[in-house]
């Protein structure tokens, strides 16, 4: 998988930001803003929450999500899972790439205590043209959106 | 915003480290070491806590701060905000780029309990020549400096 | 330390993943998978837990470790230290590069409470050919390995 980066080519990169529509409650991946504010796509495409690779190579992919709450919602598991997942033409199911588990509710020592936590993931993965990367958070009820600076998703070729 | 990286040019990068002088208590941004130890500037400038862009493009910017304390200082808000902010000649106020909120004090179940926490931010943003990026932490009283390895600030063009 | 990236050269990069053999309990650094699954080496070498630099330059190095437990093991310090360290032929001891301290056990308000936490480190450092970078976690008893997606270690030249 030797890969070269030519000096006359634009290096693929993207930064997508959280928006009011990010949390669907449908069990699908988080959705993202691709154009407004800090968001952009350069040499990558976007579809329904997914960054779509148009040029094969090694990419540093990253995501941060802002978590927060008052105590813990009834029935909420003590673990929040935040992950980056790959969809590939060669396999029908999503593949885990980078994943974190956190127990942020444990910070609140009383049921009325406000708490905040943040989860950051980043790492280099090989992606082929046509493959897609998505962000998932379980349970997404604890994701706190505001202005695109606290929850985001991005990538660039290395 | 098409941007190319020429093979004969040095790719801008910097890594600045925390120092005793980083915390000013003045309400300004954190200050950083730019030369000693692990710190360096390559194709970027520095001024009063700010990384100053000399070449327009997309940059992966990042910062980590080490937080710690014994219980929680009286009157401290339950939220710590750690952020990267942009100053631009085109707008009078700082613009939020990447921000995290955390409630690390909630980890300490007694007022005499020692606790540590860390906040990491990183993401790709477009920066014009002359624009500046700074790091702010509110409340900075909980930032724990030591030797430049626990709190730092950096960037590189992607 | 002027460094250029030639368009005809492969840019050094690596992503190493956690495996059952990662935790040795010997006081040494964590060990990593270098070939299977998501793991790869491109223009970097590996030896006994260390990424070995074959081409001098500035590298963004990163590591994430997944922490977890049930309450806190007896005798466990309230602080977990996760760090990236450099070994150089020019100095007999390892040098700290990027370090985080966390107190994740403090999240569990009872001794039988399950908790999870994650620590991420990333930053740009200058590395010479022959120098090595390792990951250490103290106390490594709280590192939770699974499938290579939760604890990992990587680098790429910037």
């Amino acid at each position: 998988l030797i890969q070269e980066r030519r000096s006359h080519e634009v290096n693929p990169a993207a930064h997508l930001t959280g928006a009011n529509s990010s949390l669907t409650g449908s069990g699908g991946p988080l959705l993202w803003e691709t154009q407004l504010g800090l968001a952009f796509l350069r040499g990558l495409s976007y579809h329904d929450g997914a960054l779509v690779v148009t040029k094969a190579g090694y990419y540093y992919i990253y995501s941060k999500v802002q978590l927060g709450g008052v105590g813990c919602p009834l029935g909420l598991a003590s673990t929040i899972t935040h992950g980056l997942y790959k969809r590939t033409p060669r396999y029908p199911e999503e593949l885990e790439l980078l994943v974190s588990q956190q127990s942020p509710c444990g910070r609140a020592t009383s049921s009325s205590r406000v708490w905040w936590d943040s989860s950051f993931l980043g790492g280099v993965v090989h992606l082929e043209a046509g493959e897609e990367v998505v962000v998932r958070v379980l349970d997404e009820r604890l994701v706190r959106l505001r202005d695109g600076t606290r929850s985001y998703f991005g990538a660039f070729m290395v | 915003l098409i941007q190319e990286r020429r093979s004969h040019e040095v790719n801008p990068a910097a890594h600045l480290t925390g120092a005793n002088s980083s915390l000013t208590g003045s309400g300004g941004p954190l200050l950083w070491e730019t030369q000693l130890g692990l710190a360096f500037l390559r194709g970027l400038s520095y001024h009063d806590g700010a990384l100053v862009v000399t070449k327009a493009g997309y940059y992966y910017i990042y910062s980590k701060v080490q937080l710690g304390g014994v219980g929680c200082p009286l009157g401290l808000a339950s939220t710590i905000t750690h952020g990267l902010y942009k100053r631009t000649p085109r707008y009078p106020e700082e613009l939020e780029l990447l921000v995290s909120q955390q409630s690390p004090c909630g980890r300490a179940t007694s007022s005499s309990r020692v606790w540590w926490d860390s906040s990491f931010l990183g993401g790709v943003v477009h920066l014009e020549a002359g624009e500046e990026v700074v790091v702010r932490v509110l409340d900075e009283r909980l930032v724990r400096l030591r030797d430049g390895t626990r709190s730092y600030f950096g960037a590189f063009m992607v | 330390l002027i460094q250029e990236r030639r368009s005809h050269e492969v840019n050094p990069a690596a992503h190493l993943t956690g495996a059952n053999s990662s935790l040795t309990g010997s006081g040494g650094p964590l060990l990593w998978e270098t070939q299977l699954g998501l793991a790869f080496l491109r223009g970097l070498s590996y030896h006994d837990g260390a990424l070995v630099v074959t081409k001098a330059g500035y590298y963004y190095i990163y590591s994430k470790v997944q922490l977890g437990g049930v309450g806190c093991p007896l005798g466990l310090a309230s602080t977990i230290t996760h760090g990236l360290y450099k070994r150089t032929p020019r100095y007999p001891e390892e040098l700290e590069l990027l370090v985080s301290q966390q107190s994740p056990c403090g999240r569990a308000t009872s001794s039988s409470r399950v908790w999870w936490d994650s620590s991420f480190l990333g930053g740009v450092v200058h590395l010479e050919a022959g120098e090595e970078v390792v990951v250490r976690v103290l106390d490594e008893r709280l590192v939770r390995l699974r499938d290579g997606t939760r604890s990992y270690f990587g680098a790429f030249m910037v």
Epitope: Q3, R6, D48, K55, P89, P92, A129, E132 | - | -
Partner: antibody, heavy 116, light 107 residues
Framework: QVQLVESGGGLVKPGGSLRLSCAAS????????MSWIRQAPGKGLEWVSY???????YYSESVKGRFTISRDNAKNSLYLQMNSLRAEDTAVYYC??????????WGQGTLVTVSS | DIQMTQSPSSLSASVGDRVTITCRAS??????LAWFQQKPGKAPKSLIY???SLQSGVPSKFSGSGSGTDFTLTISSLQPEDFATYFC?????????FGPGTKVDIK
């Protein structure tokens, strides 16, 4: 075994429309990315469009804004709606399944002729 | 777009000959290269993917090699059923592009 059968080709005037279909069998259609490729008479091959499992869609510049790819997983079918047809769209159109590489399995093709 | 060129554009060979076709990409495509065989009036058939991996059911007389910009398809011992046109195709970068083809006919 994997089978892809195209239909819907024919003679159409410039500016006209056609809808091509590709009936798939022998595999779980919804699990796969699917493509359309065309070959002008006596010429080379050109990738026209693809649709991913999640319905991400890509078009070549030559057909963007005129052609629409779609899929019906319940019917194991792939479609290509072709509008504003031009003489240069005359070709044999193939559907193909993407697995180990983008065009692993091909149908037999259907001929589209655009002429006045 | 990445341009794919093939050489020769045509060649005449005899049964039993070893035949080599080359394909060159206008920029590096790693190993993201496929080879296809097409007979008159028929659909292309995939022979090789990832530059050197044989598709299931394809006889081992076909082999591929190369990486970066230069690739070859070799037929170790040409048989009557191998007289056809051969195309290379890159799938490193959108849009995926094909070579113009190499026609192999009987000497």
């Amino acid at each position: 075994q994997v089978q892809l059968v195209e239909s819907g080709g024919g003679l159409v005037k410039p500016g006209g429309s056609l809808r091509l279909s590709c009936a798939a069998s022998g595999f779980t259609f919804s699990d796969y990315y699917m493509s359309w490729i065309r070959q002008a008479p006596g010429k080379g091959l050109e990738w026209v469009s693809y649709i991913s499992r999640s319905s991400f869609i890509y078009y070549s510049e030559s057909v963007k804004g005129r052609f629409t790819i779609s899929r019906d997983n319940a019917k194991n079918s792939l479609y290509l709606q072709m509008n504003s047809l031009r003489a240069e769209d005359t070709a044999v159109y193939y559907c193909a399944r993407w697995e180990l590489s983008p065009f692993d399995y091909w149908g037999q093709g259907t001929l589209v002729t655009v002429s006045s | 777009d990445i341009q794919m060129t093939q050489s020769p554009s045509s060649l005449s060979a005899s049964v039993g000959d070893r035949v080599t076709i080359t394909c060159r990409a206008s920029q590096g495509i790693s190993n993201y290269l496929a080879w296809f065989q097409q007979k008159p009036g028929k659909a292309p058939k995939s022979l090789i993917y990832a530059a050197s991996s044989l598709q299931s059911g394809v006889p081992s007389k076909f082999s591929g090699s190369g990486s970066g910009t230069d690739f070859t398809l070799t037929i170790s011992s040409l048989q009557p059923e191998d007289f056809a046109t051969y195309f290379c195709q890159q799938y490193n970068t959108y849009p995926f592009t094909f070579g113009p083809g190499t026609k192999v006919d009987i000497k």
